[in-house]
């Protein structure tokens, strides 16, 4: 946020940039949290726009019994590895076809034991406040589906009649990692020393990091005719004086008519 300065007073302004603001020859360049001619004002809203999508990664191991391990499978650039990868991916795409969050699989390692396939199942969902629940549910369905297929698609008399067959006991889920997105934490961090006064409110499922000085939210402070200003002790209303009235009170809701004061009478409305 920047405010341009013209005229002789500019040099004075340069040395007076506050809150880490820097003078660029014309104006104070303010850090994210501040604005105003001297960077003296604290913003009332901080952009913590969430990512469009949130990802999860499940580390799984399955044992494929319908393929015999050969040395070429250790080399990820070999034709054999590429073929195995293609067939395994096609098989897993079928297994997980009913899961909207499923993105694909990524083989990390093939090793001996028929073929032990260490791989990641990749999941992704649009960001909503419920993303954790959505991804938790998806990981449970992945577990169910891989358990089912590795129980059903098995070798009979050393022959597999499916695209791939598995060892029922060779299926393991090692680890589940969900991309962490915590708007409350981000909001607190970005608000720095004002973190106690900034909160996250949702509108159309989008999080907004706001202080009570931001109008239009449930936590918004109504300063009536005054101006809301953030300080280290919290939001405060700076009350105005008009030609006819002085305003006071925590929310500038007490108006005192000047003529009555000069006449030594107080009148509140």
């Amino acid at each position: 946020r920047t405010t341009t300065c013209f005229g002789d007073g500019c040099q004075n302004t340069a040395s007076r940039c506050k809150n880490g603001g820097t003078w660029d020859g014309l104006k104070c360049q303010c850090p994210n949290l501040y604005y105003g001619e001297l960077c003296e004002e604290v913003v009332s809203s901080i952009d913590i726009g969430p990512p469009e999508t949130i990802s999860a990664q499940m580390e799984l191991t399955v044992t494929v019994t319908s393929v015999k391990f050969t040395e070429e499978l250790k080399n990820h650039s070999s034709q054999e590895f590429q073929e195995f990868k293609q067939t395994f991916t096609e098989q897993m795409n079928i297994v997980y076809s009913g899961i909207p969050e499923y993105v694909g699989v990524n083989i990390t390692k093939l090793r001996l034991g028929s073929v032990v396939v260490e791989h990641d199942v990749l999941l992704r969902t649009k960001y909503t406040p419920e993303y954790k629940t959505v991804l938790d549910n998806a990981t449970e369905v992945v577990k169910e589906k891989i358990t089912k297929v590795t129980t059903q698609q098995i070798m009979i008399n050393d022959i597999c009649s499916d695209m791939m067959c598995f060892n029922t006991t060779g299926t393991q889920v090692q680890n589940i990692t969900v991309t962490q997105y915590d708007p409350e934490e981000d909001c607190r961090k970005m608000a720095k020393e004002y973190g106690d006064y900034f909160v996250v409110e949702y509108r159309d499922q989008k999080p907004y990091c706001i202080s009570p000085c931001e109008p239009g939210f449930s936590v918004s402070k109504n300063c009536n005719l005054g101006k809301c200003q953030m300080s280290l002790s919290g939001p405060q209303c700076l009350c105005v004086t008009t030609e006819t009235h002085w305003y006071s009170g925590e929310t500038c809701n007490q108006g005192t008519q000047k003529s009555l004061v000069y006449g030594h009478h107080h009148h509140h409305h």
Epitope: T65, S66, T70, E83, D158, C160, S161, M163, M164
Partner: nanobody, 123 residues
């Protein structure tokens, strides 16, 4: 680029014999799994015979004792000797290949296919 070209199909009387050949190129022939599949009109493609790099073979129940699969690694060729042919053997016969050592009779596991050769068994 992997290429498979079948030959040897034709019209034969019930009880007769045919020998199908498949010429392979574009990969290390001796390492993979080779197979013969067939598809009769209006039916699904089915596995007929399979041979691994170590010579291990397997056959569909319907052809056991009548068909023999073999390979000549020096010539990059696969063969299917078909004896005692029956009317129900009438189909397009396909040669299929995988670079992997497979133990599956499912067509989806084989990425490389020839164009097919027609075998008609009729009197």
């Amino acid at each position: 680029e992997v290429q498979l070209v079948e030959s040897g199909g034709g019209l034969v009387q019930p009880g007769g014999s045919l020998r199908l050949s498949c010429a392979a190129s574009g990969f290390t022939f001796s390492r993979g799994t080779m197979a013969w599949f067939r598809q009769a009109p209006g039916k699904e493609r089915e596995g007929v015979a399979f041979i691994n790099s170590d010579g291990r073979t397997s056959y569909a129940e319907s052809v056991k004792g009548r068909f023999t699969i073999s390979r000549d690694n020096a010539k990059n060729s696969l063969y299917l000797q078909m004896n005692s042919l029956r009317a129900e053997d009438t189909a397009v016969y396909y040669c299929a290949a995988s670079l992997l050592y497979l133990m599956t009779v499912n067509a989806a596991a084989y990425p490389y296919w020839g164009q097919g050769t027609m075998v008609t068994v009729s009197s």
